[in-house]
Amino acid sequence: AIVFIKEPSSQDALQGRRALLRCEVEAPDPVHVYWLLNGVPVQDTERRFAQGSSLSFAAVDRLQDSGAFQCVARDNVTGEEVRSTNASFNIKWIEAGPVVLKHPASEAEIQPQTQVTLRCHIDGHPRPTYQWFRDGTPLSDDQSTHTVSSRERNLTLRPASPEHSGLYSCCAHNAFGQACSSQNFTLSVADESFARVVLAPQDVVVARNEEAMFHCQFSAQPPPSLQWVFEDETPITNRSRPPHLRRAVVFANGSLLLTQVRPRNAGVYRCIGQGQRGPPIVLEATLHLAEIEDMLPFEPRVFIAGDEERVTCPAPQGLPTPSVWWEHAGVPLPAHGRVHQKGLELVFVTIAESDTGVYTCHASNLAGQRRQDVNITVATVPTWLRKPQDSQLEEGKPGYLHCLTQATPKPTVIWYRNQMLISEDSRFEVSKNGTLRINSVEVYDGTLYRCVSSTPAGSIEAQARVQVLEKLKFTPPPQPQQCMEFDKEATVPCSATGREKPTVKWVRADGSSLPEWVTDNAGTLHFARVTRDDAGNYTCIASNEPQGQIRAHVQLTVAVFITFKVEPERTTVYQGHTALLRCEAQGDPKPLIQWKGKDRILDPTKLGPRMHIFQNGSLVIHDVAPEDSGSYTCIAGNSCNIRHTEAPLLVVDKPVMEDSEGPGSPPPYKMIQT
């Protein structure tokens, strides 16, 4: 059986302080312990929670913790449940409140000789003791002009007189602590000869050229005087009006009327009431000229169907604050529904494609009206008008792949070739409607293409394979002029490609057949040993069934390739002497010789007096200078081949002969003696 070792007991507690209701049980089986408050299970919160089997209070609350607490233990195995005795808190607390007028019903009814009762709304447990104050000074209980009822928390003034006027406050204390009134009461018992406000002027906002009215009334015995004054202290009367208030009228009841208001009339107006005795009462009211600023324009907005979207109206500043509303197709939007207005916001709870259009935000006040349109586009996922198709494109011609889609807004189309983005260049162009143009189709354009059409709402894609229909062409085209070396083996290749593999063959241009030492092996012309007779015009013919035939004409020249009879040697020359660089070449056709010195070709027509190239090809340089030093290249060329050979030229100072060097001494360099 379940036994309580410790049961919760009733106890004193302080509002907002810690407390603990103890409960300890003993049972043979595991026991589930929970708490009831007034018979209802207690849920754990940060403030009040189970701590083991006890109930802990971080901060006692007089409202939430009043009542009977019970500790309940339940044996999970046997189903037995027992409850502790009830325990409750005696919660001590004190709470501040205002001083309020209990009698008469309103301040307006307070007159001299009236009985006035004030109540102190400080409450607590145990019942607090109260102390009243006027202007911070404690009121004693023994004065004949007032009575204090602690039980009722009341202060009664009988009868009220002007001497009772002042700020009334109260404080109270009990076992918990002390509190003072949260809001005090100002008692004003008027002297009848003092001016009192009956009607105070209010701030006014008017549009230019409209009229403005200020009301003002005082009362006193005898009746008080009333005067209106504008900002600069200029009095306003029907007899003497300041120049800028020519259209002002003061009525007998104290109201001030301003007609056809201008900006200079805006400002503070003071209504001054003066009784027979007492200070003047000055009441202020401001005349504002209505104004409204311009509205900022909207950026066009693109939204995705199905989303919740909001557009905030850039409401203009204005006086009075402009009222703002949204319209669509000239109809104001409702406060509720799928599309509605909430404050300054245009709200689409779930935006739909049909919501595309122009929405207008209006702002209006006395000064006028402003409006701004916002263009709202609800993006849709593109749909196909024409997908790219697998295509056969002809080599060398323009090729087109279509990717026609429609959506809102206009979709953007990008193309991929072999998974690589196609950037527009001289060969590829993407038109506005998404069509890809390949300006001149090449063989390697035969691959997989993919187009992606997108809007903010999503994208679609499709792919197509391009097969290139090859031109019948020579690959590469044979050189129209070619040379063969006399008495040597030579080959002249000719190959072609097309939609079908073409047959390639050689013929002589004059129609005569190839000699037996010349063979045509699948387009390669082979000369076992070139003779002079092999020179001439030859035609390579490539043909296949679907494309016909193509021809390439080649002129073959038989030549003796160039060799050097004499090559220039490494030469050292004294400055001022003449250098001779010899070079002779032979070949058929007879080679021409050119020289290159210091990395530029020496033009025979522009050599000047110091340099000369002989008929046999040798180069002579007179009066050599150090800057002539360098590498010289002899280039021999004819229509069939070109060869070159080079040698360095070094120009040195002539040495001064020393005594030790007799005529028999060898020169320091191998010289050309000139």
Partner: antibody
Framework: QVQMQQSGAELMKPGASVKLSCKAT????????IEWVKQRPGHGLEWIGE????????NSNEKFKGKATFTADTSSNTAYMQLSSLTTEDSAIYYC??????WGQGTLVTVSA | DIVLTQSPASLAVSLGQRATISCRAS??????????MHWYQQKPGQPPKLLIY???NLGSGVPARFSGSGSGTDFSLNIHPVEEDDSAMYFC?????????FGGGSRLEIK
């Protein structure tokens, strides 16, 4: 010793109500929770709810709210479970148990048109 | 609701060997220092019988061959050595929260 004696088998029409009883002996009836469990072939065991006879307090499975109502008569030490708006889905063996240890023999309810 | 997942759904164990059944809870069933997880055995035509209560406590009159372990969300029932009479359905149940929920059951067969 603790015993839980349940009422006999019931054959009911769809839409009808049935009240099952569970008589407890051998312990203080008011201080122990009585639990009700449903068993359908191939559906395992389902906890329907429980009642503490002394206070009349009960807890039930949300799934059976509106289907099962628990009461107890302390004078006869008997707990009751009423099943309303019967359907073929309610065909099952219903057990009562005091805690986890002492189970009744079960009552077979068959709902058939 | 706390969901209890039992595994395996069925097992066949040779006489004298060990049988282990697992039960996993969708959230912790620990409270007041106890694990409120219990194990039952049920044979055809009979009501369930309490084997283990509060995860590891042996029920009244239950042989010591049965043992339970685990805390929080993972629990297991062990039978060793298995006897012919142990052929039955086994269920786990949590009583931490209303509704008290049962596992789907595990059928033990003796080979």
């Amino acid at each position: 010793q603790v015993q839980m004696q349940q009422s006999g088998a019931e054959l009911m029409k769809p839409g009808a109500s049935v009240k099952l009883s569970c008589k407890a002996t051998g312990y203080t009836f008011t201080g122990y929770w009585i639990e009700w469990v449903k068993q359908r072939p191939g559906h395992g065991l389902e906890w329907i709810g429980e009642i503490l006879p002394g206070s009349g307090r009960s807890n039930s499975n949300e799934k059976f709210k509106g289907k099962a109502t628990f009461t107890a008569d302390t004078s006869s030490n008997t707990a009751y479970m009423q099943l309303s708006s019967l359907t073929t889905e309610d065909s099952a063996i219903y057990y009562c148990a005091r805690g986890k240890l002492s189970w009744g023999q079960g009552t077979l309810v068959t709902v058939s048109a | 609701d706390i969901v209890l997942t039992q595994s395996p759904a069925s097992l066949a164990v040779s006489l004298g060997q060990r049988a282990t059944i697992s039960c996993r809870a969708s959230e912790s069933v620990d409270s007041f220092g106890n694990s409120f997880m219990h194990w039952y055995q049920q044979k055809p035509g009979q009501p369930p019988k309490l084997l283990i209560y509060a995860a590891s406590n042996l029920g009244s009159g239950v042989p010591a061959r049965f043992s339970g372990s685990g805390s929080g969300t993972d629990f297991s029932l062990n039978i060793h050595p298995v006897e012919e009479d142990d052929s039955a359905m086994y269920f786990c149940q949590q009583s931490k929260e209303v509704p008290r929920t049962f596992g789907g059951g595990s059928r033990l067969e003796i080979k």
